[in-house]
Interface confidence: low
């Protein structure tokens, strides 16, 4: 009767579009056949997709973020067949271009100005803010109450990802108007 | 491993059709990729036809190809092999085989396990 096998990882952290990972189906044994699976399905037919040492090593090139799925090795051997409990690779990537929100870009004097931004990420990025180019809180989210013309300019968004070592942003123009001279909306 | 059992073979005409069914017992079915292959007397062991463990992958033998359709039913744990169009040159013994498969494709050399197979004679 074989053993129930497991899965050993050279990389249990990759970042997307740079690294590989190899996954490693334990034990070693003679006269045995290696599968994989992801996701309880077949592997699919990929050129990032390598079955090296006796199908025992899986290799992952280039590791996207569609990666990070339960990987499941089995063996078999002409008297019996077991598989590993799956294990879930967790892909670094982004952050991707943020996405500030509400998209509204003008607003009546006077109203509350809310404004959030998100970032695909993992893990989570760091956010901050600039209001023309002046640096603001270290938040996700930028809060103004009662804005005045005064506060007319570009917004800005900054994320950053310190595990991937990346960063990204995006840049909004916010526009003020007078009560009651704009068909703006309010916050 | 699995136990297959083969039904659905006959005595048909040429140009006729048959459809043979391989049900399939025992654990972790949706793990393995099912084939037909056949045997007729005096000749080697011949693929005709696979399909994947997902069922999306489908593999024909050149000369079955257009005529014969496999395909799995996960629910029913039930391979299908629709065989229409029959020639004199199908006639054989038909055998539903398994391979234990990552790969999400199949092929007629490596399976390991085999049904005990069901007669089909195309015949006037």
């Known amino acids: 009767e074989l053993p129930k096998p497991s899965i050993s990882s050279n990389n249990s952290k990759p970042v997307e579009d740079k690294d590989a990972v190899a996954f490693t189906c334990e034990p070693e044994a003679q006269n045995t056949t290696y599968l994989w699976w992801v996701n309880g399905q077949s592997l699919p037919v990929s050129p990032r997709l390598q079955l090296s040492n006796g199908n025992r090593t899986l290799t992952l090139f280039n590791v996207t973020r569609n990666d990070a799925r339960a990987y499941v090795c089995g063996i078999q051997n002409s008297v019996s067949a077991n598989r590993s409990d799956p294990v879930t690779l967790d892909v670094l990537y982004g952050p991707d271009t943020p996405i500030i929100s509400p998209p509204d870009s003008s607003y009546l004097s006077g109203a509350n100005l809310n404004l959030s931004c998100h970032s695909a990420s993992n893990p989570s990025p760091q956010y901050s803010w600039r209001i023309n180019g002046i640096p603001q809180q270290h938040t996700q989210v930028l809060f103004i109450a009662k804005i005045t013309p005064n506060n007319n300019g570009t917004y800005a968004c900054f994320v950053s990802n310190l595990a991937t070592g990346r960063n990204n942003s995006i840049v909004k123009s916010i526009t003020v108007s007078a009560s009651g001279t704009s068909p703006g909306l309010s916050a | 491993q699995l136990q297959l059992v083969e039904s659905g073979g006959g005595l048909v005409q040429p140009g006729g059709s048959l459809r043979l069914s391989c049900a399939v017992s025992g654990d972790r079915w949706d793990y393995y990729a099912i084939g037909w292959i056949r045997q007729a007397p005096g000749k080697e062991r011949e693929g005709v036809s696979c399909?994947?463990?997902?069922?999306?992958?489908?593999n024909y033998a050149d000369s079955v190809k257009g005529r014969f359709t496999i395909s799995r039913d996960n629910a029913k744990n039930t391979v299908y092999l629709q065989m229409n169009s029959l020639k004199p040159e199908d006639t054989a013994v038909y055998y539903c085989?398994?391979?234990?498969?990552?790969?999400?494709?199949?092929?007629?050399?490596?399976?390991?396990?085999r049904g005990q197979g069901t007669q089909v004679t195309v015949s006037s």
């Open positions: 085989s398994t391979e234990f498969t990552g790969w999400d494709r199949c092929g007629f050399d490596e399976y390991d396990h």
């Open positions: 399909i994947s463990s997902s069922g999306r992958t489908t």
